[in-house]
């Protein structure tokens, strides 16, 4: 697996990361943490493992957390209820 | 060739349930979710929900909640659409549609031909 | 839920014309810089056809007369020069909130 750096699909990626769009450059995806408490998110990501590609600059929050609306249009990860 | 064939036409009555099938074929089942999809008689298009065909899980319109019931039997590359407490505004087209490789665009490259489920008494 | 809202119901346009259907959303449906948006086309007695995603993104095999754009709530689905094969309905649809939904429709029809 790749740690760190390009990939194409999760299955790339190590524990605890998926393979998510850079946000410095839109072309190319890279191993990205999963969200953890207070990350901003969107409640829509792929949960892991996904097997196509993202398009999404962010992935879901780790286990045990939720994307959850803070107010308008905003999301973060939170403890699940 | 990628194929999604969906089972025939049924006719219900009021409160009774329908279990629509839906079989895939030409590509990987599991790699791929599946959504389902409802048409009125010359009206436009409703989502009901979709499921990993991985690992099962699903996510419903909550207009649909307690209602639907979406699940997949890995061992025939098959979805099914469940339904219950039918009432006439019920009747529609039902349709399958794989979703395609666009990550979070969700978008249904191929459909199934439909099932129309008509709800009378 | 997110309404979808599209403009004109019907349209007819004479062929090799260019055809604008505008579809409006009740909120934004961007995220990090994308819009959300899908189109599909539909022919009487077919289901839907994926024309584009995510608001610009052609859709494979379908021909580059049909272009789509906007973004926030103000979407857009042109076909350049209108050919006979696409007469049909043709629906937007949002994925950035669950529940994904549809606009009405727009019938094209050719004048």
């Known amino acids: 697996a790749v740690i760190t750096g390009a990939c194409d699909k999760d299955s790339q990626c190590g524990g605890g990361m998926c393979c998510a769009v850079s946000i410095w450059v839109k072309s190319i995806r890279i191993c990205t943490p999963m969200g953890k408490l207070g990350d901003s998110c969107h409640p829509l990501t792929r949960k892991v493992p996904f097997f196509g590609r993202r398009m999404h600059h962010t992935c879901p929050c780790l286990p045990g957390l939720a994307c959850l609306r803070t107010s308008f249009n905003r999301f973060i990860c939170l403890a699940q209820k | 060739e990628v194929q999604l064939v969906q089972s025939g036409a049924e006719v219900k009555k009021p409160g009774a349930s329908v279990k629509v099938s839906c079989k895939a074929s030409g590509y990987s089942f599991t790699d791929y979710d599946m959504h389902w999809v409802r048409q009125a008689p010359g009206q436009g298009l409703e989502w009901i929900g979709y499921i990993s065909c991985y690992n099962g899980a699903t996510t419903y319109n909550q207009k649909f909640k307690g209602r639907v019931t979406i699940t997949v039997d890995k061992s025939t590359s098959t979805a099914y659409l469940e339904l219950s407490s039918l009432r006439s505004e019920d009747t529609a087209v039902y349709y399958c549609?794989?979703?395609?490789?666009?990550?979070?665009?969700?978008?249904?490259?191929?459909w199934g031909q439909g099932t129309l489920v008509t709800v009378s008494s | 839920d997110i309404v979808m809202t599209q403009s004109p119901d019907s349209l007819a346009v004479s062929l090799g014309e260019r055809a604008t259907i505008n579809c409006k959303a009740s909120?934004?449906?961007?995220?990090?810089?994308?819009?959300?948006m899908n189109w599909y086309q539909q022919k009487p007695g077919q289901p839907p056809k994926l024309l584009i995603y995510?608001?610009?993104n052609l859709e494979s095999g379908v021909p580059d007369r049909f272009s789509g754009s906007g973004s926030g709530t103000d979407f857009t689905l042109t076909i350049s020069s209108l050919q006979a094969e696409d007469v049909a309905v043709y629906y937007c649809q949002q994925i950035n909130e669950d529940p994904f939904t549809f606009g009405q429709g727009t019938k094209v029809e050719i004048k």
């Open positions: 909120q934004s449906v961007d995220y990090d810089g994308d819009s959300y």
């Open positions: 549609a794989r979703e395609g490789n666009y990550g979070e665009a969700y978008a249904m490259d191929y």
């Open positions: 995510a608001a610009s």
